[in-house]
Amino acid sequence: EPPTACREKQYLINSQCCSLCQPGQKLVSDCTEFTETECLPCGESEFLDTWNRETRCHQHKYCDPNLGLRVQQKGTSETDTICTCEEGLHCTSESCESCVPHRSCLPGFGVKQIATGVSDTICEPCPVGFFSNVSSAFEKCRPWTSCETKDLVVQQAGTNKTDVVCGPQDRQR
């Protein structure tokens, strides 16, 4: 009686179970009663990443430099090429089809997490006692200067965008 289901890594064709081609190979011809499934390795710049019965391999992804992309990991016959973004850019999506510049944290905000090739800068507001007076994709909020440790007094309080201004102890108001 012909089978209705096949084992893992097999497929049903013409009422018989044939072996699937292993990753990195494509199907040339189905098995018969007398012959095994015929498979061929994928060509240069092609891949198949699963046990399959595909007659064509997939093309490796092209990391287009015009879109700010570069190769992070070269593809093999079993894996696709992985693209990432050039320095200062990050992917616009999980599949990384194009790149955009990293966001800068505005004055009053500091970098909580520096951007990577796949994630944008995360900014956070500077709390009281800290400031940032620059627009930057790298700088964290900096602590206000401690006038006391310099034997000085605060002449002007700091803000989230400015440091404290220190002055001499004997300053007359």
Epitope: Q113, E124, P125, V128, G129, V153, V154, Q155, N160
Partner: antibody
């Protein structure tokens, strides 16, 4: 020990001004922020503004900007909060409290004055 | 401005009960540089000034009984009274001090059941 002693209760007419004082002792007055907070009858706490007495630097809540003036006299270790153009909704207990002491790590209010009741009524 | 929302607005409890009050901030009060949460809790009794209980979200102010504790991080915070005492019937406020203007929660009144 740290103490903040406020001036006595006031009754004011609408449109007038009130000036509440807060005399500090037991710590370095000039280097610690003085905060002003008010509480209308049966209501919650509302921050109005603050001053760093040694520098005269101030911060004000937007709601009170232009109507409140916070000052300090370091020679007498006294802070003042003046509220102008009074209306009935300004009837409240006004508190002063000590904020950060220059260490930049103590922004919470660890000592409070006893409060000053200001009643605005025609 | 950072909004602070407390719940519940009132709670009826008996002496010995465990009481939990929550406070939610409209933005994170946690700062990555020092990993501190800029939040304080105060207790206020009728006709009295507020009293500091907890600062940095979980540090107990000197002289405050250990039955009071604070927890939470980011936007969600809790004040817990492990075993309510007669003197604990009061109104409790959370307050952030992350950035100006400082704001308070609307308060939670702990009443006798």
């Amino acid at each position: 020990q740290v103490q903040l002693v406020q001036s006595g209760a006031e009754v004011k007419k609408p449109g007038s001004s009130v000036k509440v004082s807060c005399k500090a002792s037991g710590y370095t007055f000039s280097t610690s922020w003085i905060e002003w907070i008010r509480q209308a009858p049966g209501q919650g706490l509302e921050w109005m503004g603050s001053i760093l007495p040694g520098s005269g630097s101030t911060n004000y809540a937007q709601k009170f900007q232009g109507r409140v003036t916070i000052t300090a006299d370091t020679s007498t270790s006294t802070a003042y909060m003046e509220l102008s153009s009074l209306r009935s909704e300004d009837t409240a207990v006004y508190y002063c409290a000590r904020g950060d002491d220059g260490s930049y790590v103590r922004w919470y209010f660890d000592h409070w004055g006893q409060g000053t009741l200001v009643t605005v009524s025609s | 401005d950072i909004q602070m929302t407390q719940s519940p607005s009132s709670v009826s409890a008996s002496v010995g009960d465990r009481v939990t009050i929550t406070c939610r901030a409209s933005q994170s009060l946690n700062f990555s540089v020092n990993q501190k949460n800029y939040l304080a809790w105060y207790q206020q009794k009728p006709g009295k000034a507020p009293k500091l209980l907890i600062y940095w979200a979980s540090s107990l102010q000197s002289g405050v009984p250990s039955r009071f504790s604070g927890s939470g991080s980011g936007t969600d915070f809790t004040l817990t009274i492990s075993s309510l005492q007669p003197e604990d019937f009061a109104t409790y406020y959370c307050q952030h001090y992350y950035s100006y203007p400082w704001t308070f929660g609307q308060g939670t009144k702990v009443e006798i059941k």
